[in-house]
């Protein structure tokens, strides 16, 4: 079972990304990830989290925003935004430590 080593009870989440095997997945928590790659429109992916919960605590940047929640299909209707572009000297890093 690929999610055997997850902490606590599993939750069912909406799965919307190119790598989803179906409309839902099961994991330790639900995720929404909004990513903007250079020169492209932001992509919003929904899925399940089992590792590195610290990503959920990272602050949004102009390139990425991570959101996590812990209840049944809680990621279904969540919409994220990115931080507005900041001057280079004020840009937050992606490292959340």
């Amino acid at each position: 079972d690929p999610v055997k080593p997850s902490r606590g009870p599993l939750v069912t989440c909406t799965c919307e990304s190119p790598h989803c095997k179906g409309p839902t997945c099961r994991g330790a928590w639900c995720t929404v990830v909004l990513v903007r790659e250079e020169g492209r429109h932001p992509q919003e992916h929904r899925g399940c989290g089992n590792l590195h919960r610290e990503l959920c605590r990272g602050r949004p940047t102009e390139f990425v925003n991570h959101y996590c929640c812990d209840s049944h299909l809680c990621n279904h209707n969540v919409s994220l935004v990115l931080e507005a572009t900041q001057p280079p000297s004020e840009q937050p890093g992606t490292d959340g430590q």
């Epitope: 690929p2 999610v3 055997k4 080593p5 997850s6 902490r7 990304s17 190119p18 790598h19 995720t31 990830v33 990513v35 992916h45 899925g47 399940c48 089992n50 590792l51 590195h52 919960r53 610290e54 990503l55 990272g58 390139f63 990425v64 991570h66 890093g93 992606t94 490292d95 959340g96 430590q97």
Partner: antibody, heavy 118, light 108 residues
Framework: QVQLQESGPGLVKPSQTLSLTCTVS??????????WNWIRQHPGKGLEWIGY???????YYNPSLKSRVTISVDTSKNQFSLKLSSVTAADTAVYYC??????????WGQGTLVTVSS | EIVLTQSPGTLSLSPGERATLSCRAS???????LAWYQQKPGQAPRLLIY???SRATGIPDRFSGSGSGTDFTLTISRLEPEDFAVYYC?????????FGQGTRLEIK
């Protein structure tokens, strides 16, 4: 079959920046199930975790190296990279890249020896 | 930061014997994210056990893992010549990821 391959200079001068790239084949670096790690091993010593990157570009680093480390990802090339600045002889090591999943670090590159010397 | 301490540092045994390797954490860790690796000279580490007790793909059933809280064990029930190597435990899945210092399993 997933494969990881490190590449980059085997010799770096002191005070310069070490740069390595890990190319992933047989699987997508953009899958949300995986985290992409760098690990190093000093000659005759144990394993030291350097940091990881997620497909989103979010990174976490070993606190002892954080001030000198940058990890980046290029999903279009299915690659992720390591930069370690201001290197000294103490950074001489075999550097590995590895994929992390719920099943641990399940795939590793073969490792590349980087020597810091003038 | 959690420290993993492996013991013994070196274990000298003969083929056919049973090997018991210990990994102790400085504080309680999730058994879901404790792994064991084998490394031979000149090679990358190879995943043996994840989630404390689940064998990785292709790993023979003579390798088993157990434990909880702060104390974890890798057992090799009957040593084969190819099992003599260095073994590392690891905490993964949250930062900082840490490795034990290793146990060298050598032929007696």
């Amino acid at each position: 079959q997933v494969q990881l391959q490190e590449s980059g200079p085997g010799l770096v001068k002191p005070s310069q920046t070490l740069s390595l790239t890990c190319t992933v084949s047989g699987g997508s670096i953009s899958s949300g199930e995986y985290y992409w790690n760098w690990i190093r091993q000093h000659p005759g010593k144990g394993l030291e975790w350097i940091g990881y990157i997620y497909y989103s570009g979010s990174t976490y680093y070993n606190p002892s190296l954080k001030s000198r480390v940058t990890i980046s990802v290029d999903t279009s090339k299915n690659q992720f990279s390591l930069k370690l600045s201001s290197v000294t002889a103490a950074d001489t090591a075999v550097y590995y890249c590895a994929r992390e999943s719920v099943a641990g670090f399940d795939y590793w590159g073969q490792g590349t020896l980087v020597t810091v010397s003038s | 930061e959690i420290v993993l301490t492996q013991s013994p540092g070196t274990l000298s045994l003969s083929p056919g014997e049973r090997a018991t390797l210990s990994c102790r954490a400085s504080q309680s860790v999730s058994s879901s994210y404790l792994a064991w690796y084998q490394q031979k000279p000149g090679q990358a580490p190879r995943l043996l056990i994840y989630g404390t007790s689940s064998r990785a793909t292709g790993i023979p059933d003579r390798f088993s893992g157990s434990g909880s809280g702060t104390d974890f064990t890798l057992t090799i029930s009957r040593l084969e010549p190819e099992d003599f190597a260095v073994y590392y435990c690891q905490i993964y899945g949250s930062v900082p990821i840490t490795f034990g210092q290793g146990t060298r399993l050598e032929i007696k």
